[in-house]
Interface confidence: medium
């Protein structure tokens, strides 16, 4: 049994707040029509609401978000040679979070 | 296009490292046979490796982990009254990460 490793500390709730998450920049965000390219970087950090609330009827939701455009490199492969282009991807960062009732519509500013 | 909101900064790669994530403590982790109870807290923070690597043949993987037992409250509902018990859940924290080739076997300490 693994229980003997250390004394069990009381578990602390992961409160509803913004945390750093990894967002994968999929190629479809850059170009839906062509798959013959790479994106750099393949992933970036975003701020997202996570954690849990006091009961199942409420969820951790963003109350304020911000759109953040970032520039990525689109590396097209043409006749086995790389051609470097630039593209813009708009990321969504969560700025503030709140435990909200599941069915409630929420204004996002 | 949203590019006019602000100037697009160059995207920075989300490097392979430990980040704080939220781990859901599901009831089945506590008791397989009985669904007539609640777990508190319903979720906790863990440290997990995330981020991306230079190419698709490598993945961000933990190289060192720690198993951490935590004590949760199992709140049984008996004749509409709550009975408080304790249970232990073993969490896994990642302590160190590395970009490793996908198929490589890896020792974990």
């Amino acid at each position: 049994s693994l229980g003997s490793l250390t004394i069990a500390e009381p578990a602390m709730i992961a409160e509803c707040k913004t945390r750093t998450e990894v967002f994968e920049i999929s190629r479809r965000l850059i170009d839906r029509t062509n798959a013959n390219f790479l994106v750099w970087p393949p992933c970036v950090e975003v701020q997202r609401c996570s954690g849990c609330c006091n009961n199942r009827n409420v969820q951790c939701r963003p109350t304020q978000v911000q759109l953040r455009p970032v520039q990525v490199r689109k590396i097209e492969i043409v006749r086995k040679k790389p051609i470097f282009k630039k593209a813009t991807v708009t990321l969504e960062d969560h700025l503030a979070c709140k435990c909200e009732t599941v069915a409630a519509a929420r204004p996002v500013t | 296009s949203l590019g006019s909101l602000t100037i697009a900064e160059p995207a920075m790669i989300a490097e392979c490292k430990t980040r704080t994530e939220v781990f859901e403590i599901s009831r089945r982790l506590i008791d397989r046979t009985n669904a007539n109870f609640l777990v508190w807290p319903p979720c906790v923070e863990v440290q997990r490796c995330s981020g991306c690597c230079n190419n698709r043949n490598v993945q961000c993987r933990p190289t060192q982990v720690q198993l951490r037992p935590v004590q949760v409250r199992k709140i049984e509902i008996v004749r509409k009254k709550p009975i408080f018990k304790k249970a232990t859940v073993t969490l896994e924290d990642h302590l160190a990460c590395k970009c490793e080739t996908v198929a490589a076997a890896r020792p974990v300490t």
Epitope: - | F23, S26, R28, L29, C49, E92
Partner: antibody, heavy 120, light 107 residues
Framework: EVQLVESGGGLVQPGGSLRLSCAAS????????MSWVRQAPGKGLEWVST????????SYADSVKGRFTISRDNSKNTLYLQMNSLRAEDTAVYSC?????????????WGQGTLVTVSS | DIQMTQSPSSLSASVGDRVTITCRAS??????LNWYQQKPGKAPKLLIY???SLQSGVPSRFSGSGSGTDFTLTISSLQPEDFATYYC?????????FGGGTKVEIK
């Protein structure tokens, strides 16, 4: 409803490689340890490997150690088994199974399995 | 490695019979013993865990007992749907090991 669906099996020559996948749904995949168990035709059950919920702790049967690698992608709710240097005795139906918590090395729910045949 | 020995390897019984299957571990495994049922062409199903705890949704005619090295699975009154192969498994230590199985057939 818990669902585990394996894929990637097939016929492979001795010494060859194969990668099995197990797509999970109906439960919080990232909260559970997962395993691979195999069953040779007409034989009993044999544990192959187990991986922790976060992917950092792995364990293997001696018969596959150094040849097989278990991994998972929690963002895709998928479990993998990379099988290298395959041998005739690896021929079996490979099933993924949900293994409960860290102190619980058992198998709550199973997939239907995918057949791996190693033959020249 | 811990060896798990099941007996008998097969048995014939009738509907309504009381059936007992035994499983012996080569060393003490406390109560870390689980029982599974497998029907032909189907995935195994967990019946009993921790030697005597009934898995959710499993009929109460199935029961488990024992600790240390000797364990028993009992079906109090065999039903038509119970004809299958039963496996024990120790979850005390890796490598995890199964018994060889007991096939319960119709008499």
């Amino acid at each position: 409803e818990v669902q585990l669906v394996e894929s990637g099996g097939g016929l492979v020559q001795p010494g060859g490689s194969l990668r099995l996948s197990c797509a999970a749904s109906g439960f919080t995949f990232s909260s559970y340890w997962m395993s691979w168990v195999r069953q040779a035709p007409g034989k009993g059950l044999e544990w192959v490997s187990t991986i922790s919920d976060g992917g950092g702790t792995t364990s293997y049967a001696d018969s596959v150690k150094g040849r097989f690698t278990i991994s998972r992608d929690n963002s895709k709710n998928t479990l993998y088994l990379q099988m290298n240097s395959l041998r005739a005795e690896d021929t079996a139906v490979y099933s993924c199974a949900e293994s409960g918590g860290a102190t619980d090395y058992l198998f709550d729910y199973w997939g239907q399995g995918t057949l791996v045949t190693v033959s020249s | 490695d811990i060896q798990m020995t099941q007996s008998p390897s097969s048995l014939s019984a009738s509907v309504g019979d009381r059936v007992t299957i035994t499983c012996r571990a080569s060393q003490s495994i406390s109560s870390y013993l689980n029982w599974y049922q497998q029907k032909p062409g189907k995935a195994p199903k967990l019946l009993i865990y921790a030697a005597s705890s009934l898995q959710s949704g499993v009929p109460s005619r199935f029961s488990g007992s024992g600790s240390g090295t000797d364990f028993t699975l009992t079906i109090s009154s065999l039903q038509p749907e119970d004809f299958a192969t039963y496996y024990c498994q120790q979850s005390y230590i890796t490598p995890l090991t199964f018994g060889g199985g007991t096939k319960v057939e119709i008499k």
